[in-house]
């Protein structure tokens, strides 16, 4: 069964700056990942940034560099800033549509207790999804 | 079938405002950021920016911040892009192309003439 | 922003022969993570808009004939049309699809002798 995991990470320098990275943790060939928070994408949630493999990457404030790390797992840079920028609660979530497995779907936030420039490992975050 | 049907063309004059739609059909509006596109008569082609219907969130290109301003209603699946302080310049033929570029607009002819 | 140099601006060849057209942009447009290529190719005929043939520089998108090949990396990038067919005339455009704002080059605009 394919799993999805989720780390978020809150930066040392800056302290409303956040890293999310999330991973595939599947043999199917990825098609498309999205991120969003307060939530699903499509249930309540925003999307941050949707990354194709091939076609390229979108990004919306406040995303500021969304990359892929690896051919399954990406990374996304958020500004902390300004009134759309996120606390230290907000959930953040990844999903991956991918071929033959469909798309899967985990969230992620901050550790309640996580210092500045630590978080928690990326083990794989709860499958909320799977259409 | 997606479909991307744009507004008719424009006549305007310089120092005027213009505001164009692109009424998308086919596909769930909210899924797929929309873009925006520039072609000027004989011209390459210049990316304007792109707008998320999930939440209104946009990306301009620098060299069109100020001069266009680009909305979305999601209750009629439609992108609009405002353009302001025309001036001859600015005539052209504006695309909307949905993420990707795979799908296209027709095009808005927009005329800046006095 | 990354700048989109295409050449030749324009060319004209006989049904049937191949051409190549050339791309290269002022950055990579490789995503080192995944190691892609964020390049995109289209073809677009008088009084049209646009049409993708082509993204990450080498993948035909649905529907378009495979005479139409993607091929580069990096900076350099080429669009070869194998065997040119009378509907092929129209101005071939590429596109760097890697960095905000998505530059486009000037195109290479292809005639039929």
């Known amino acids: 069964t394919p799993e999805v995991w989720v780390q978020v990470r809150m930066e040392a320098t800056e302290l409303s700056s956040f890293t999310i990275r999330c991973g595939f943790l599947g043999s199917g060939s990825i098609s498309l990942v999205t991120v969003s928070w307060g939530g699903p994408n499509g249930a309540g949630g925003t999307t941050l940034a949707v990354l194709h493999p091939e076609r390229g990457i979108r990004q919306w404030a406040p995303a500021r560099q969304a990359r892929w790390e690896t051919q399954s797992s990406i990374s996304l840079i958020l500004e902390g800033s300004g009134a759309s920028s996120p606390c230290a609660n907000t959930t953040f979530c990844c999903k991956f549509a991918s071929f033959p497995e469909g798309s899967w779907e985990a969230c992620g936030s901050l550790p309640p207790s996580s210092d500045p420039g630590l978080s928690a490992p990326p083990t794989p975050a709860p499958i909320l999804r799977a259409d | 079938e997606v479909q991307l049907q744009q507004s008719g063309p424009e006549l305007v004059k310089p120092g005027a405002s213009v505001k164009m739609s692109c009424k998308a059909s086919?596909?769930?509006?909210?899924?797929?950021?929309m873009n925006w596109v520039k072609q000027s008569h004989g011209k390459s082609l210049e990316w304007i920016g792109d707008?998320?219907?999930?939440?209104?969130?946009?990306n301009y290109n620098q060299k069109f911040k100020g001069k266009a301003t680009l909305t979305v209603d999601r209750s009629s699946s439609t992108a609009y892009m405002e353009l302001r302080s025309l001036t001859s310049e600015d005539s052209a033929v504006y695309y909307c192309?949905?993420?990707?570029?795979?799908?296209w607009g027709q095009g808005t002819l927009v005329t800046v003439s006095a | 922003d990354i700048v989109m140099t295409q050449s030749p601006s324009s060319l004209s060849v006989s049904e049937g022969e191949k051409v190549t057209m050339s791309c290269k942009s002022s950055?990579?447009?490789?995503?080192?993570?995944?190691?892609?290529?964020?390049l995109a190719w289209y073809q677009q005929k008088a009084g049209q808009p646009p049409k993708l043939l082509i993204y990450?520089?080498?993948t035909r998108e649905s529907g378009v004939p495979d005479r139409f090949t993607g091929s580069g990396s990096g900076t350099d990038f080429t669009l070869t049309i194998s065997s040119v067919q009378a509907e092929d005339l129209a101005v071939y455009y590429c596109?760097?699809?890697?960095?905000?704002?998505?530059?486009f080059g000037s195109g290479t605009k292809l005639e039929i002798k």
């Open positions: 192309a949905r993420v990707w570029f795979a799908y």
């Open positions: 707008i998320n219907p999930n939440n209104g969130g946009t």
């Open positions: 990450g520089a080498s």
């Open positions: 086919g596909y769930t509006f909210t899924d797929y950021s």
């Open positions: 950055q990579s447009l490789l995503s080192s993570g995944n190691q892609k290529n964020f």
């Open positions: 596109q760097n699809a890697h960095s905000s704002p998505f530059t």
